[in-house]
Structures are given as C-alpha cells and as structure tokens.
C-alpha cells in the first residue's frame, strides 16, 4: 500500500498524526469499528502533550479511547505498552466495578468531563476520537 | 427556578402535522441534554427522542424514527418537537425533559406537558 | 432494545408500611436506573438516579438499591402523599426505556 503523507478532510493533523472528532454517541465496540472502517483506531494516548490536545477538542464530554481491559489486562487497540506508557486516570481509577453484573466489569476507558480517564460500562454512547499515523502504509492500493 | 413549560398540543387529522416547543428556564439551557417522552391514556410513559446540549447527537424511539424530529434552539431556550404523518397511537400527552448532564445522563426535571390527539 | 420488567403492577398498602417495588431489566445495565414517581394528572417527579443516589429535595424514605438486572425501590413508611405511580427507567443506552409502572393504593 501506499503511503499516507497528510490527513484525510476534516481530520486533524497533530505531531504526524491524524484525529478525527465525533460529534454523535456510540457503544465502544461500535466506535472501535468505525474507526478501523477509516484505517484508523480509537486514539492512543502515550504523551501528556497528546492527552492536553484531545482534551483541547472534546471538550467536557465523555468520549472513548482506544483502551479497554476485556480480555483480561488494560491494553491499547494498536499494541502500545499499558504498564510503562503515560497514564492519566482519575482517583480511585480504574475500579473495574463488577457491581453492575454485566459479567465482566467496566471494561472499557473514556475521558471525563475534566479530561481525567474513567472505566465505565461499554455499552454507554459516548463520543470518540479516531486517530491514525502519517507516514504508515495505508490499505489502498498505490496511484499509478 | 428551573422550570419547562411545553405548548404546542392540540387537536390534529392523521397524516398531518404537529410542532411541539418547551420554553426553558432557570438554567443554562445550551449546557444540558434534552429529551421528549410521552404518556397516552391510561398507559404508562414512553421514551420519544434526545437532543445532546449542543444538537449534535439526536436519537429517537423505534415508533417515531422517521416521522418526529427534535431540534433546539439555544439562544431562545426552546427545545422542539416536530411531528409529521401524526398517527392515532402518537395520541399523549408530551413531557419535555431534562437530562441530568449532556444527554446520556438521566432525566431530572420533567414539564407539565401538552397534550396530542389525533383523530379524525 | 432493554426490557423493563416492574413489579408488582399494582399494591395496597396502608400509612406508615414499608412498600417495595422491584425492576429487573432484560439485560445487564450497570447501575443507570432511575426510578420517578407520578400522580394523576401531572408530570411524573424524578426520585433517584444511578439506582440509588436520591435527587435533591427528595425525602430519605425513599432509597434504591440494586445493579447489573435487578433493582428495588423502598419506600420505608408510606405516607399518604406517597400513594402514585411509581416508574422505573434505563439510560444505560438508547433507546431508553421505562418498566410499566407499580400503582401504589391505599388499602
């Protein structure tokens, strides 16, 4: 595949990357699919520079990331490093609260209204942020 | 206080149309979620639409979806509801509601509501 | 869509009793229940939110508990005000849906 150089229209483009701002509320699972539709993924925080730039654009509404612990362990959909990257929770977070009997406890990560990370139910509509990066191989095919 | 006080209601033929409005106030109207939900007579109340605090999310009961539309407007305090192609069972008295934040949250403050009939 | 499943549909209860009301969804919804409550003829008042946190102004005998399906409503010693409708509601997802309400009679 080729290459991509600049962003797609009304992306964002942010330190060689591209963000893109929903404006609607969808379940993780359903904002996880639309941004891999894009040839992206929900946006993976690994700066405290990057966390102030979404934060920045989402304003103070609950809005999903690419990080969720329903396979077990906290992990970042594109393989970044949970234990040693940057983090940003709120106190007391995450608490992976099984009260709620959905099986498998809050599974899945957002950002709170002062930006602050939160585990909650995934099911939950919520804002999303798709991100991917200038410079990887796109899934299209070359122009020739 | 916070208060909503819908309007709009009234008598109206099936396949026609009907524009409901909440007045708002007491608040900041353009920082909360709205909602419409609907009671007809004699049952119980039924969830119709919601309206993020900024119009930017909007969705709606399976029963309504293609035929009401919610819509604000901020400057004015007003929350909206217009209905098309009415049917008997739209027949209810029309609560606007509150959300307790920007439209996932709940519903804490409820109007008096107005009151839909359609018939022939 | 989530299914609300309130019971008992209806009650008699006399002053000062203790009355409880219970709400199970057809699917897990966390702890994003409400519960209102409505007397004939006017608009239905929002008693709790998160299944169990009371709104404000709304009196202490009123508690809610429960989580994942299965939520209850207590009212610990009924007073004649208190005689209504009582509805549950999910707002874990939308649609959001109401259970088909507890009418609540004086004995």
């Known amino acids: 595949g080729s290459e991509r150089t600049c962003c797609p229209v009304n992306w964002v483009e942010h330190e060689r990357s591209c963000y893109w701002f929903s404006r609607s509320g969808k379940a993780w699972a359903d904002a996880d699919n639309y941004c891999r539709l894009e040839d992206a993924h929900l946006v993976v925080v690994t700066s405290w520079e990057e966390q102030k730039f979404v934060q920045r654009h989402i304003g103070p509404v609950n809005t999903w990331m690419g990080l969720h612990d329903q396979n077990g362990p906290w992990k970042w959909v594109d393989g970044t490093d949970y234990e040693t990257g940057f983090k940003n929770w709120r106190p007391e977070q995450p608490d992976d609260w099984y009260g709620h009997g959905l099986g498998g406890g809050e599974d899945c990560a957002h950002f709170t209204d002062d930006g602050r990370w939160n585990d909650d139910v995934c099911q939950r509509p919520y804002r999303w942020v798709c991100e991917t990066e200038l410079d990887k191989a796109s899934q299209e095919p070359p122009l020739l | 206080q916070v208060q909503l006080v819908e309007s709009g209601g009234g008598v109206v033929q099936p396949g026609r149309s009907l524009r409901l409005s909440c007045a708002a106030s007491?608040?900041?109207?353009?920082?909360?979620?709205m909602h419409w939900v609907r009671q007809a007579p004699g049952k119980g109340l039924e969830w119709v639409a919601v309206?993020?605090?900024?119009?930017?999310?909007?969705n709606y009961a399976d029963s309504v979806k293609g035929r009401f539309t919610i819509s604000r407007d901020n400057s004015k305090n007003t929350l909206y509801l217009q209905m098309n192609s009415l049917r008997a069972e739209d027949t209810a008295v029309y609560y606007c509601?509150?959300?307790?934040?920007?439209?996932?949250?709940?519903?804490?403050?409820w109007g008096q509501g107005t009151t839909v009939t359609v018939s022939s | 869509d989530i299914q609300m499943t309130q019971s008992p549909s209806s009650l008699s209860a006399s002053v000062g009793d203790r009355v409880t009301i219970t709400c199970r969804t057809s699917?897990?919804?966390?702890?994003?229940l409400a519960w209102f409550q409505q007397k004939p003829g006017k608009a239905p008042k929002s008693l709790l939110y998160?299944?169990?946190s009371l709104q404000s102004g709304v009196p202490s005998k009123f508690s809610g508990s429960g989580s994942g399906t299965d939520f209850t409503l207590t009212i610990s010693s009924l007073q004649p005000e208190d005689f209504a409708t009582y509805y549950c509601?999910?707002?874990?997802?939308?649609?959001?849906?109401f259970g088909g309400g507890t009418k609540v009679e004086i004995k």
């Open positions: 509601a509150r959300d307790q934040g920007v439209g996932y949250d709940g519903l804490d403050v």
């Open positions: 007491g608040f900041t109207f353009s920082t909360y979620g």
């Open positions: 309206i993020w605090y900024d119009g930017s999310n909007k």
């Open positions: 699917q897990g919804i966390g702890n994003y």
């Open positions: 998160k299944a169990s």
């Open positions: 509601q999910q707002y874990m997802t939308y649609p959001l849906t």
